[in-house]
């Protein structure tokens, strides 16, 4: 997971999310995305 500190003093956490393709379609394999989390 990556963590970025901004001038505001808050930290925003970015988290990699992985899904199986068969859960959202008909293909095999994994789908990797990036979620920008809430302010901590």
């Amino acid at each position: 997971d990556a963590e970025f500190r901004h001038d505001s003093g808050y930290e925003v956490h970015h988290q990699k999310l992985v899904f199986f393709a068969e859960d959202v379609g008909s293909n095999k394999g994994a789908i990797i995305g990036l979620m920008v989390g809430g302010v901590v």
């Epitope: 988290q15 990699k16 999310l17 992985v18 899904f19 199986f20 393709a21 068969e22 859960d23 959202v24 095999k28 394999g29 994994a30």
Partner: nanobody
Amino acid sequence: EVQLVESGGGLVQPGGSLRLSCAVSGGTFSSIGMGWFRQAPGKEREFVGAISRSGDSTYYADSVKGRFTISRDGAKNTVYLQMNSLKDEDTAVYYCAGRPAGTAINIRRSYNYWGQGTQVTVSS
């Protein structure tokens, strides 16, 4: 109520192998996405790997890729974690977990069914 029961843990020397099993009961096995997590002393529970509902797809954490293999047997309602080339840092309590279809496979909060855990100790 879905129940998960792990077995197969134990003490193994570095470089050795173990196979963990996770028996699933009380639910429709084919509808549950299965994953494995582990928790070492003083550390957070971390994702190890997951297998799709069909068993056609797997995904692993970088730390175990190429050494660990997950499989599932629909006839036995069981998921397996084959662990090879074990290292000291693989020592942990290993948990199998189940999640609904469509949820992210690599984060704890996707999983709403958990086993009790089985201890794996890698030591010479």
